[in-house]
């Protein structure tokens, strides 16, 4: 376990070999989750890229946060995709949080502390626990089949995950840098493996 506080993973160039694999202590399937993270890239007006890829053996896009060029954020659960449009692209560090719950299918998507309109996806579904969680690449199969044109070029950090839906107050606290206790992925006690050309550097966001 490593305390990654105030650090970020840096992916300096496009590749299909560089990634970070995150280890999560999941023992049972997820009926809800929240993922929060920071990232920083210049790619958004050029092409799509993967931000957070969680694959199981039955479904490579079990959870996927992806930037889709000309549209905005693509969020996938269990292979089903919804879009959160971003009308104007700016090059700046971004903080996102997204949550999903099986009981209602409700998805929340927060960008820099501001909520988007809630949407619905995969009501009644359960997310598999035996997962390959990858930063920097989009998995087209469990733990692999990466395509360079979907890779992240830039920085990513503060990746935290919970097995429940955070309240708006809690998401606001996280965005403002307040205290929190993630129970699936914890950036302050991170188990991970680096493959290829990935560097750990001080974070560039406040």
């Amino acid at each position: 376990q490593t305390d990654m506080s105030r650090k970020a993973f840096v992916f300096p160039k496009e590749s299909d070999t560089s990634y970070v694999s995150l280890k999560a202590p999941l023992t049972k399937p997820l009926k809800a989750f929240t993922v929060c993270l920071h990232f920083y890239t210049e790619l958004s007006s050029t092409r799509g890229y993967s931000i957070f890829s969680y694959a199981t053996k039955r479904q490579d896009n079990e959870i996927l946060i992806f930037w889709s060029k000309d549209i905005g954020y693509s969020f996938t659960v269990g292979g089903s995709e919804i879009l959160f449009e971003v009308p104007e692209v700016t090059v700046a560090p971004v903080h996102i949080c997204t949550s999903w719950e099986s009981a209602s299918g409700i998805v929340e998507f927060w960008v820099d502390g501001k909520p988007r309109v809630r949407k619905s996806l995969k009501k009644g579904y359960t997310v598999g626990a035996e997962a390959s969680i990858i930063l920097g690449q989009e998995q087209d199969s469990f733990g692999g089949n990466f395509e360079g044109s979907q890779s992240l070029v830039g920085d990513i950090g503060n990746v935290n995950m919970w097995d429940f839906v955070l309240s708006p107050d809690e998401i606001n606290t996280i965005y403002l840098g307040g205290p929190f206790s993630p129970n699936v992925l914890n950036w302050r006690a991170l188990k991970y493996e680096v493959q290829g050309e990935v560097f750990t550097k001080p974070q560039l966001w406040p």
């Epitope: 992806f66 693509s74 087209d140």
Partner: nanobody
Framework: EVQLQQSGPELVKPGASVKISCKAS????????MNWVKQSHGKSLEWIGN????????IYNQNFKDKATLTVDRSSRTAYMELHSLTSEDSAVYYC????????????WGQGTLVTVSA
């Protein structure tokens, strides 16, 4: 459920152009290349080319480089193929089919669009 829904049949005059569409649903659009295939009457299938919806990059069969233009509209999850300077040789059924970048086969196909070139 994965579906590729193509536009309806077209009757066009020689020398004209035609643009046919393929609307995708039931999967992450950016994750698969969209291929186009020609089937002329009594002939085997010919691969025209593909487009990567993630980057807009295209790859063409050299035989169709000046005949077809492949594009995508991500917001509507639709792929398009425009055929130029049509002749009777271009009369055929045209199919869209999706593939992963590493797959040599196409698991899902559209229903086909019949293009008839006639004066």
């Amino acid at each position: 459920e994965v579906q590729l829904q193509q536009s309806g049949p077209e009757l066009v005059k020689p020398g004209a152009s035609v643009k046919i569409s393929c609307k995708a649903s039931g999967y992450m659009f950016s994750d698969y290349y969209m291929n186009w295939v020609k089937q002329s009457h009594g002939k085997s299938l010919e691969w025209i080319g593909n487009v990567d919806p993630n980057t807009d990059n295209t790859i063409y069969n050299q035989n169709f480089k000046d005949k077809a233009t492949l594009t995508v509209d991500r917001s509507s999850r639709t792929a398009y193929m425009e055929l130029h300077s049509l002749t009777s040789e271009d009369s055929a059924v045209y199919y869209c089919a999706r593939s992963r970048f590493y797959d040599p086969w196409f698991a899902y196909w559209g229903q086909g669009t019949l293009v008839t070139v006639s004066a």
